[in-house]
Amino acid sequence: FGISGRHSITVTTVASAGNIGEDGILSCTFEPDIKLSDIVIQWLKEGVLGLVHEFKEGKDELSEQDEMFRGRTAVFADQVIVGNASLRLKNVQLTDAGTYKCYIITSKGKGNANLEYKTGAFSMPEVNVDYNASSETLRCEAPRWFPQPTVVWASQVDQGANFSEVSNTSFELNSENVTMKVVSVLYNVTINNTYSCMIENDIAKATGDIKVTESEIKRRSHLQLLNSKA
């Protein structure tokens, strides 16, 4: 490429989290080049003997790819020319967590940036009224979490109240023996109130809200990844 080694290009990464068993994205962008054949992308993982992924001369070069990533990686080939070096990682594993390096060579120079990739399991909770219970009870369920999260209940009417004495949370290991189903039950619920079930670990925070009135039940839930500079 005629690179002297004195020139450096800007490479930018974004810390992110992967949901085990699903596909993930390791984000990386760089100053684009006009010729695809002049661009080399290398993804490396700290402490791993082989490469995570290599893309050069317009195609994947996987002869030195590490066994743990075999068949699980892809770049967005049509977006490389515009400076997107992001890596798609299929079927994220718990052991994919760690520090990654996105290393770029173009005709303008070289550059690299590291990113922290966390892995775990996180899912949206659903809050329902438990009609089988003897008293007014809410049941909050989320199918997949790892590591084990904390569960906290809150109420719009009784802001700041501690519901730990009137709630019960259990964690049930799923069939793959890693993730767990989260079930939390809140007792002594009053109507005309909005209750929130908040599930959080070091990777994600999810909230399920339920508004119970005489005439209707309204639900809402959302999930936020933590420590991701999105």
Epitope: Q42, L44, K45, E46, G47, V48, L49, G50, L51, S63, E64, Q65, D66, E67, M68, Q93, T95, D96, A97, G98, T99, K101
Partner: antibody
């Protein structure tokens, strides 16, 4: 100061098992791949096995595949080699060595332990 | 698997001599080659990595060259402390292999 200290060697009968340990200190253990290398008496060096920093990848020489298992406990900064179905030809001094941090960039096998002797004999 | 062949197996030399050891790989390993020095009863010591990069603290009389399948370790002026056995090692991707060793002895 980087230090690697092997233990667990000794005399074992053919077909027996042994577990070697390597206690590491002086560096961020989880950031580095680690390897085991052995040297039979009066012979050359033979790479045995390696494991990635997070433990997600393991690698073996053909001569030990299926018999030896490498593992690590990053919370204890310790590397292990479980050796099963031992043979006379496994008799050697076993060294642990710090392997790479980054593919293609860093030095490797820059620090070694003092070695532990494994003797397989009836 | 990638094989490494070192030559010569034994080398007799005198203090002040220029010594060259060759290492050939059975297939291309680019520049993924290291050189080690070992003395009796001691663990090996890294001298050269990435074919030609000198490890910190290693005297400049040691140098490495080559790429692909042919590599050399050169000691420009042999010192008394250099009499030892030298090994090349390839680390192409996730395999590692050592050469059979070259013993440098006093002539």
């Amino acid at each position: 100061e980087v230090q690697l200290l092997e233990s667990g060697g000794g005399l074992v009968q053919p077909g027996g098992s042994l577990r070697l340990s390597c206690a590491a200190s002086g560096f961020t253990f989880s950031s580095y791949a680690m390897s085991w290398v052995r040297q039979a008496p009066g012979k050359g060096l033979e790479w045995v096995s390696a494991i990635s920093g997070g433990g997600g990848s393991t690698y073996y020489a053909d001569s030990v595949k299926g018999r030896f298992t490498i593992s690590r406990d990053n919370s204890k900064n310790t590397l292990y080699l479980q050796m099963n179905s031992l043979r006379a030809e496994d008799t050697a001094v076993y060294y642990c060595a710090r392997d790479i941090q980054w593919y293609g960039e860093s030095t490797l096998f820059d620090y070694w332990g003092q070695g532990t002797l494994v003797t397989v004999s009836s | 698997d990638i094989q490494l062949t070192q030559s010569p197996s034994t080398l007799s030399a005198s203090v002040g001599d220029r010594v060259t050891i060759t290492c050939r790989a059975s297939q291309s390993i680019r520049s993924w080659l290291a050189w080690f020095q070992q003395k009796p009863g001691k663990a090996p010591k890294l001298l050269i990595y990435k074919a030609s990069s000198l490890e910190g603290g290693v005297p400049s009389r040691f140098s490495g060259s080559g790429s692909g399948t042919e590599f050399t370790l050169t000691i420009s002026s042999l010192q008394p402390d250099d009499f030892a056995t030298y090994y090349c090692q390839q680390y192409n991707s996730y395999s590692r292999t050592f050469g059979q060793g070259t013993k440098v002895e006093i002539k």
